[in-house]
Amino acid sequence: LQPGSSIPPYNTEVTETTIVITWTPAPRIGFKLGVRPSQGGEAPREVTSDSGSIVVSGLTPGVEYVYTIQVLRDGQERDAPIVNKVVTPLSPPTNLHLEANPDTGVLTVSWERSTTPDITGYRITTTPTNGQQGNSLEEVVHADQSSCTFDNLSPGLEYNVSVYTVKDDKESVPISDTIIPAVPPPTDLRFTNIGPDTMRVTWAPPPSIDLTNFLVRYSPVKNEEDVAELSISPSDNAVVLTNLLPGTEYVVSVSSVYEQHESTPLRGRQKTGLDSPTGIDFSDITANSFTVHWIAPRATITGYRIRHHPEHFSGRPREDRVPHSRNSITLTNLTPGTEYVVSIVALNGREESPLLIGQQST
C-alpha cells in the first residue's frame, strides 16, 4: 500500500491466521495496528511497534476483520487512521493422500479437514499434468467429508489432484499432489494342456477397462534372460506357448497394456512335461534275447523304465529300471519265435514321459 505522502510507506500481508504490517524503520516513527472481527465474537486486539513490523496472530481463517492502521510520530497519533476490511483466507485441508486401486482403476482421495469454521465443503479436481490428453474431473463434497473417489481416469497418465476448502464463494489455496493411476493387471493365472513343449496359459482380464493388449512373457526359470514375448489381443484371455524345452520349469508373466503403459505382471511358474525317448531300434537278435536301443529325450531325466512282454500276453510284463546314462538294454530269457512288445518311459523322479513303444520278434 502506498497511502498519502505524509504516511511512511508500509506493506500489509494477510494469511489465514495473521495480519502483518511491515515498514522501513525510521527515527521517531511507529505504527499501531488494531484488529477486530466485523461480526464480533472475538476481542479486539491492538499492537504498537516502531521495530518495522507488527504481527497480529491467532485469527480465524475465513472470517472478515476490520483492521486499523495508525501512524505514530514521537508516540503521538498525528494522522487520521486508515481503516480496511479483509477476509482471512480459508485454510486448505492437510495430509492429502492419493491411492489408486490397480484392480478397479478407482482413485481414492483423502485429506484432513480444514481448520476453517463453518465451511461449505471441499472441491476436488483431477487434471492431467503438462497438458496431456485426458479427462479433467471435479467433485464437490460436504464439509463433513474427508475423502472422495474418482473413476474413469486414464491408467498410466499423470494427474494433478487438488483439494480446495470452499466457503460460500471463496476457496482456499489447494493442497495438491500427483499420481499415475496403475493399469489394472489380469488375475487368475492358470496353466492347462501341459505337454513336453507346449502349455496353455489363461487369465482373467481386469474389469471395466478397454485395454490395448496383453503382454505375455516367458522364460526358463534357470535362464531368465532368455525371454520370449507375445502380444495378445485384449479380447483374448488365453495363449498356447509352443517350442518350449521339455522337462523345464518356466516363469510366465501376463501384463495388461493400456496405450503405452503396462500393469504390474501377474506371474506364475509351470514345468513342461518330459518328452519321450525316440528312435527305438533292435539289434543282436537271437532265439532268446535281443538288444533294445533308443535316443534319450531332451529333458533332464533320472532314468528309464523298460517293460517287455509277448504281444498277446495279459500277464504282468517284465520291467527294468535303467539309469539315465544308458540308452540300450539287452533283454534275455525270451521265448524263441515270439513277438515282443517293448515300451520305454523316461523318468524324472516320479514324473513319467509318454511311452515309446516298439515290437520285435526273437
Epitope: 527294468d320 546314462s325 538294454i329 533283454l331
Partner: antibody, heavy 115, light 107 residues
Framework: EVQLLESGGGLVQPGGSLRLSCAAS????????MSWVRQAPGKGLEWVSD???????NYADSVKGRFTTSRDNSKNTLYLQMNSLRAEDTAVYYC?????????WGQGTLVTVSS | DIQMTQSPSSLSASVGDRVTITCRAS??????LNWYQQKPGKAPKLLIY???TLQSGVPSRFSGSGSGTDFTLTISSLQPEDFATYYC?????????FGQGTKVEIK
C-alpha cells in the same frame, strides 16, 4: 548292513571259462540294479556289466558276447559267466550295488588268465 | 566313450594339509560325477556322488565341486586314514568310465 561277497575266482587258461558269484544281503536285492567292475593288477577301475532289476543287461564292448551277467533274486545272488577268457581279463572282479553310483562294493575276487 | 583325466597322478602330503585333486571330462557330464577312495587290497568306497553330495557316513572334511567338464575333490585337513588312491567316475553316459586314479602318499 549291506554286504556283498564275491567268489569263484581263480587261475584259468586263455580260452577257458569261469563263473563268479556275488552273494548279497542287507538290502532288497531284487529291487536294485547290480554291476560288475574289474581292476587289473596295478591299474584303474573298469566297468564290465550291469544287470537291472528286471534282468535286462548291458556290457562293456570289451566283454560283449563273451561274458553274461545274470541274477537269481530268490537266492539274492548275482553271477558273471566268463567265457573265452583272455590274458587281458586278468583282474580283481568286484560286484557293486546299483548302476552309476556304486554305493556298496564286495571285497573282490581275483581272476588270473594265464597259460 | 568319455575320457576322464585326473591330476595329479600322485601327490605327497602331510597330516593336516589341504589336498585338492582335479578331474576333467573329455566332454560335458553335467554334475554326474562320483568320487571313490580305495586303500591297498580293499574295495573302492563311494565318497561323493553327483559332484558335491557327501555319501552317508563320509567325514565332512571331504568335499566335491564342479560341473560340466571340471571337477575337484578337496580334503580340508588330511588325516592318517586318508592316505589312499582316489578315483573319479562319470555317470553321464554309457559306458560309465573312471579316471586313472590319484595316489595320496605320506610326505
Amino acid at each position: 548292513e549291506v554286504q556283498l561277497l564275491e567268489s569263484g575266482g581263480g587261475l584259468v587258461q586263455p580260452g577257458g571259462s569261469l563263473r563268479l558269484s556275488c552273494a548279497a544281503s542287507g538290502f532288497t536285492f531284487s529291487s536294485y540294479a547290480m554291476s560288475w567292475v574289474r581292476q587289473a593288477p596295478g591299474k584303474g577301475l573298469e566297468w564290465v556289466s550291469d544287470i537291472y532289476d528286471g534282468g535286462g543287461t548291458n556290457y562293456a564292448d570289451s566283454v560283449k558276447g563273451r561274458f553274461t551277467t545274470s541274477r537269481d533274486n530268490s537266492k539274492n545272488t548275482l553271477y558273471l559267466q566268463m567265457n573265452s577268457l583272455r590274458a587281458e581279463d586278468t583282474a580283481v572282479y568286484y560286484c557293486a550295488k546299483t548302476a552309476d553310483n556304486f554305493d556298496y562294493w564286495g571285497q573282490g575276487t581275483l581272476v588270473t588268465v594265464s597259460s | 566313450d568319455i575320457q576322464m583325466t585326473q591330476s595329479p597322478s600322485s601327490l605327497s602330503a602331510s597330516v593336516g594339509d589341504r589336498v585338492t585333486i582335479t578331474c576333467r571330462a573329455s566332454q560335458s557330464i553335467s554334475s554326474y560325477l562320483n568320487w571313490y577312495q580305495q586303500k591297498p587290497g580293499k574295495a573302492p568306497k563311494l565318497l561323493i556322488y553327483a559332484a558335491s553330495t557327501l555319501q552317508s557316513g563320509v567325514p565332512s572334511r571331504f568335499s566335491g565341486s564342479g560341473s560340466g567338464t571340471d571337477f575337484t575333490l578337496t580334503i580340508s585337513s588330511l588325516q592318517p586314514e586318508d592316505f589312499a588312491t582316489y578315483y573319479c567316475q562319470q555317470a553321464n553316459s554309457a559306458p560309465t568310465t573312471f579316471g586313472q586314479g590319484t595316489k595320496v602318499e605320506i610326505k
